[in-house]
């Protein structure tokens, strides 16, 4: 089996506020079983912005049909964009398990805030 | 306590068609992978077919695949399997299985590599 | 396939440990089934290479590495006395067995 890849094509993504942000990931396996989750940051600080399993995200939708069971595009929207949005969002595969365990992270995608035009 | 009851079993004959029902409790089934185990006489556990926790996803073993279909009734909380035209090596005891790990999102597949509860077993006896 | 010694044996308070080899990557899962008698209903004593289902004895413990897994049974007493099934998945199986291990419990 291929090892399973966490792709995250862009390096940055520049937004102006109040805009929404597209922030893209794709897998490259539907194995090792587990939900993807979206961070800002990284290490034990890092804030979750994006859970598949569970929980409530009223700002985050997913742009691809996520109900879907080959679906292998965890991209995600992010709506009404400020500057505090500002930072490095990580797309995470979690192996399922008693808890999941991260398994692989994408390299990462800055965005930035641009002032909202007059 | 989560519990797994199978019925359905006893003596068939050659060619028939059986309906094994597996009735869970103390869970959701519509949170979890099922699936079906089987053991001949004197023999080992033998995967025969499971159903992923979304309710489409199946997958069966060649030994069943064309005869067998497997089938959950959230409601009822049960899982059925249905096997077609049986053949002697279709005896042994059926296991209902349930995977431990909760899955209601779309990205799981139909595995039972993680079981944690079984049932008792029901008796099926292909003969004529 | 799942590949584990067909028998073992030991005294009442050895440690015993049972292997189990596949062509497991990382990806899937081992788990061991405890039967005490053919046809009867197993038993899960271990789950996720490692966790213990409530109710089990703390004797029992399991571990993972690479394509190999073993369950330890520290301290065995007669009534662990069974077949032990190991099971995983591959790539185009939602479950495998080995062919089990009986465990024989002397004195």
């Known amino acids: 089996e291929e090892e399973l890849q966490v792709i995250q094509p862009d390096k940055s993504v520049s937004v102006a506020a109040g805009e929404s942000a597209i922030l893209h990931c794709t897998v490259t396996s539907l194995i090792p079983v587990g939900p993807i989750q979206w961070f800002r940051g990284a290490g034990p600080a890092r804030e979750l912005i994006y859970n598949q399993k569970e929980g409530h995200f009223p700002r985050v939708t997913t742009v691809s049909e996520s109900t879907k069971r080959e679906n292998m595009d965890f991209s995600i929207s992010i709506s009404n964009i400020t500057p505090a949005d500002a930072g490095t969002y990580y797309c995470v595969k979690f192996r399922k398990g008693s808890p999941d365990t991260e398994f692989k992270s994408g390299a990462g995608t800055e965005l930035s805030v641009r002032a909202k035009p007059s | 306590a989560v519990t797994l009851d199978e019925s359905g079993g006893g003596l068939q004959t050659p060619g028939r068609a059986l309906s094994l029902v597996c009735r869970g409790s103390g869970f959701s089934i519509s949170s979890y992978n099922m699936g079906w185990v089987r053991q001949a006489p004197g023999k080992g556990l033998e995967f025969i077919a499971s159903?992923?926790?979304?309710?489409?996803?199946?997958h069966y073993a060649p030994a069943v695949k064309g005869r067998a279909t497997i089938t959950r009734d959230v409601g009822q909380s049960t899982v059925r399997l249905q096997l077609n035209n049986l053949r002697a090596e279709d005896t042994g005891t059926y296991f209902c299985?349930?995977?431990?790990?909760?899955?209601?999102?779309?990205?799981?597949?139909?595995?039972?590599?993680?079981?944690?509860?079984w049932g008792h077993g029901t008796e099926v006896i292909v003969s004529s | 396939a799942l590949t584990q010694p067909s028998s073992v044996s030991a005294n009442p308070g050895e440690t015993v440990k049972i292997t189990c080899s596949g062509d497991n990557s990382a990806h899937y899962y081992y788990g061991w089934y405890q039967q005490k008698s053919p046809g009867s209903a197993p038993v899960t004593v271990i789950y996720y290479n490692d966790k213990r289902p409530s109710g089990i004895p703390s004797r029992f413990s399991g571990s993972a590495s690479g394509s190999t897994a073993t369950l330890i049974i520290t301290g065995v007493q007669v009534e662990d006395e069974a077949v032990y099934f190991c099971?995983?998945?591959?790539?185009?199986?939602?479950?495998?067995f080995g062919a089990g291990t009986t465990l024989t419990v002397l004195g």
């Open positions: 299985a349930k995977d431990a790990y909760q899955c209601s999102y779309a990205t799981c597949n139909d595995y039972l590599d993680t079981i944690d509860a």
């Open positions: 099971g995983s998945a591959d790539s185009s199986n939602p479950a495998i």
């Open positions: 159903i992923g926790s979304d309710g489409s996803s199946t």
